[in-house]
């Protein structure tokens, strides 16, 4: 298995909340004698090996923050202790795991490492990590909300989307579709009465500039994503291209920094044909994602 970081840099204003995310991909042994730990810790920049040094996050060690999967068990962590420190670690069944930090201060700035450890019965550990930087800013230069920059260690010499494994793209798109579709359909009636013009629905899709092979010999492809609005019938084009097995052309990918949308709060739409057509386009696109990806 390997670990991918969706973003390499998060820039946030003081007082904001941020969710740092990693994703586990590749073959994962689900045997009864295998235990997985997913956790977070802080490290130092400028090390020979990134994440080799470890320090606590807000005085909590990696053991305080870990999520523990034994065999087929669900993940669990010492939630109360973490939440008292304004922290929460979480994991889903798609391989994503995250840490949410509330009420950021300048002291939270630094390098954060996500870690996955596999332990077989009576054996030592096999571990893989990812790294990302958090910059907490204050004053007039600070953004109004958190901004996440996609992982792109070689943006200047990007090979384009094809260097990211197709199944990783599928994994990203599938979970994004699930969140976007169900989030949009679950909007309350009050949201539909919003008189202001609807913002474009956001679908979390990979960025061309960040789908590049890491230069380090044994490290994973860094397959990242940005929240990017797609206009009109581009949904259908992207869906048909994916269905035909083509990795989408650069024009479908928006590689700029992404505003971090709070989780479980999809962009609101108003009543009317515009939003319905857009929802239909997203639906067709997402159906093609699910069909195409299920054939992999």
């Amino acid at each position: 298995f390997k670990v991918a970081t969706l973003y390499s840099l998060y820039v946030c204003p003081e007082g904001q909340n941020v969710t740092l995310t990693c994703r586990v991909f590749g073959p994962v042994d689900k045997g009864h004698d295998v235990t997985f730990y997913k956790t977070w810790y802080r490290s130092s920049r400028g090390e020979v090996q990134t994440c080799s040094e470890r320090r606590p996050i807000r005085n909590l060690t990696f053991q305080d923050l870990h999520l523990h999967h034994g065999g087929h068990q669900a993940a669990n962590t010492s939630h109360d202790l973490a939440q008292r420190h304004g922290l929460e670690s979480a994991s889903d069944h798609h391989g994503n795991f995250s840490i949410t930090m509330r009420n950021l201060t300048l002291l939270d700035s630094g390098l954060y490492c996500c870690l996955v450890v596999e332990i077989r019965h009576h054996h030592s550990e096999h571990r893989v990590h990812g790294a990302m930087e958090l910059q907490v800013q204050t004053g007039k230069d600070a953004p109004s909300s958190c901004v996440a920059y996609p992982s792109s260690s070689q943006e200047s010499e990007s090979k384009g989307p094809s260097s990211c494994p197709f199944w990783v793209i599928c994994s990203l798109l599938s979970s994004s579709c699930t969140q976007t579709l169900f989030g949009t359909l679950a909007l309350s009636p009050q949201a539909h009465r919003n008189p202001s013009p609807p913002p474009p629905l956001l679908l979390h899709i990979p960025s061309a500039s960040s789908l590049v092979q890491s230069p380090e010999a044994h490290s994973p492809s860094i397959c990242s994503g940005v929240s990017a609005p797609l206009a009109s019938l581009e949904w259908l084009c992207l869906g048909s291209h994916l269905w035909l097995g083509k990795v989408p052309h650069d024009r479908y990918w928006v590689p700029q920094a992404a505003k971090c949308c709070p989780s479980h709060q999809p962009p609101m739409t108003s009543e009317g044909w515009g939003s319905r057509i857009q929802l239909l386009q997203i639906s067709v696109f997402c159906v093609s994602v699910f069909l195409r990806c299920s054939l992999l």
Partner: antibody, heavy 121, light 112 residues
Amino acid sequence: QVQLVQSGAEVKKPGASVKVSCKASGYSFTDYYINWVRQAPGQGLEWMGRIFPGSGNAYYNEKFKDRVTMTRDTSTSTVYMELSSLRSEDTAVYYCARDDSFYGYWYFDVWGQGTTVTVSS
Amino acid sequence: EIVMTQSPATLSVSPGERATLSCKSSQSVLYSSNQKNYLAWYQQKPGQAPRLLIYWASTRESGIPARFSGSGSGTEFTLTISSLQSEDFAVYYCHQYLSSYTFGGGTKVEIK
């Protein structure tokens, strides 16, 4: 730099207890296991157990589990190893050593200078 | 537990010569998930604490001279000192960290 400094030599009578300290500096004390390894005169190395300072949880070698207690004081970044019911065969140099594991086992990258414990009537 | 056996117990070598130390484990210390051997080598001089030389069976610790090299996989391992210097005469221990911790009995490298 990363350093482990141990307390001085001890002479004890059989049946007594000894408490050896190991003070850590140069790294985040709470986030790395500290192990205790002993070496009898002219003999090899024997692992006694380890403690995770962040939680205070200790794990002991079966051979010593009834007689050894490992504790820590996070305010002074110090780990302690107490061995009770001493006998002459406990005469040895006792080392503390840091390991780099998260949940399993790992090699020992930093060692203390050692504490000689002599058990004699 | 995994038993580590080192041989020879004592190795007499002249300065500048090559020294080859052997370590065998009672069961494999190779982890299938990452194909790494969980084996380390330490050097110990009289009156001093052990010092880490090699980990993962063949990776030299930073600051360790290139004349020290480790090899082997599974159950059989070798520490080679290509050209012995005066400061290399010491006792060498192998250590498995796959399943708890056990050490070999040590090999003393002495001046011939």
